[in-house]
Interface confidence: low
């Protein structure tokens, strides 16, 4: 999906008002220094591409983020403020329903959400210092 047509300011408002708090709630009890940020992004569309990938694509050791509150709100924000996004996600949603039966918080998931926090922060302050 090409995220260049999204309404970035509306997505930013959704992040600041709710998604950021849900991410903090998910990470509660974890030290902010526990994980190193290894994923970054340079422009807001690039950030959304990385955020979508980390939030909704199952990874080894963490296949259960899609049903978390922050993920559902992220999906809603993208669906509302990115034209045509919902249509591209129909097949992906069917796959997620099969893959994610229960919510399990693993250390890998905590690390992934820590990366997401970094990506969202970069979304609000884009322009990577170096490519």
């Amino acid at each position: 999906y090409d995220f260049t047509n999204c309404d970035f300011e509306k997505i930013k408002a959704a992040y600041l008002s709710t998604i950021s708090k849900d991410l903090i709630t998910y990470m509660s009890g974890t030290k902010s220094t526990e994980f190193n940020n290894t994923v970054s992004c340079s422009n807001r569309p690039h950030c959304l591409t990385e955020i979508q990938s980390l939030t909704f694509n199952p990874t080894a050791g963490c296949a259960s983020l899609a049903k978390e509150m922050f993920a559902m709100k992220t999906k809603a924000a993208l669906a509302i403020w990115c034209p045509g996004y919902s249509e591209t996600q129909i097949n992906a949603t069917q796959a997620m329903k099969k893959a994610r039966k229960s919510k399990v918080t693993t250390n890998k998931c905590l690390e992934q959400v820590s990366q997401l926090q970094g990506l969202w922060r970069r979304f609000n302050r884009p322009l990577l210092k170096q490519q």
């Epitope: 090409d2 260049t4 047509n5 340079s42 422009n43 807001r44 569309p45 690039h46 302050r125 884009p126 322009l127 990577l128 210092k129 170096q130 490519q131």
Partner: antibody, heavy 117, light 107 residues
Framework: EVQLVQSGAEVKKPGASVKVSCKAS????????MHWVRQAPGQGLEWIGM????????TLIQKFKDRATLTVDKSTSTAYMELSSLRSEDTAVYYC??????????WGQGTTVTVSS | DIQMTQSPSSLSASVGDRVTITCRAS??????LAWYQQKPGKSPQLLVY???TLAEGVPSRFSGSVSGTQFTLTISSLQPEDFATYYC?????????FGGGTKVEIK
Amino acid sequence: EVQLVQSGAEVKKPGASVKVSCKASGYTFTTYWMHWVRQAPGQGLEWIGMIDPSDSETTLIQKFKDRATLTVDKSTSTAYMELSSLRSEDTAVYYCARTLDGYYDYWGQGTTVTVSS
Amino acid sequence: DIQMTQSPSSLSASVGDRVTITCRASENIYSYLAWYQQKPGKSPQLLVYFAKTLAEGVPSRFSGSVSGTQFTLTISSLQPEDFATYYCQHHYGTPWTFGGGTKVEIK
């Protein structure tokens, strides 16, 4: 209304330094990055570097790393570009421009720097 | 560094003509390309960003498109105020680089 107002034209001798200012108004200064671009007479646009006003982190292209210094004064919402060891090929119009995603939605009016002996 | 090759360097056209300017990136920059218009003695003005998004206040006769690493700025019907120099610029990552410019002159 967003405005970037630059300092006036400068005439300098080779080997001297010049400091160009860019005063921002009409938006939150620390939200946007400030980039500097120059244009030699009759030539195209050349990117010099950028500064993040929120933390003063700068990135300069290699050819300017030793001679250019980018700074900001958050209290006055002003960005500065200082270029030292001036030579004749530094004669150009210097622009500041603000950006979030790397494209420039507002530019300063430009500052002409003439280097001549 | 990413090189931006812009063509033609100049062109002559008449009012009402359809004008096309192209810019080729030396590597994949996705949709991270902007177009600017510059008139003599003035600062550049943003026309298009993210390859095809029209900047605020820019007339709809301007449009941008992308195919791989080739980017196109089209003016569907040239107006007297459109005679100027046009620059492309990638905004994919540092260092930002510009194309050499295209001067659009009156035929």
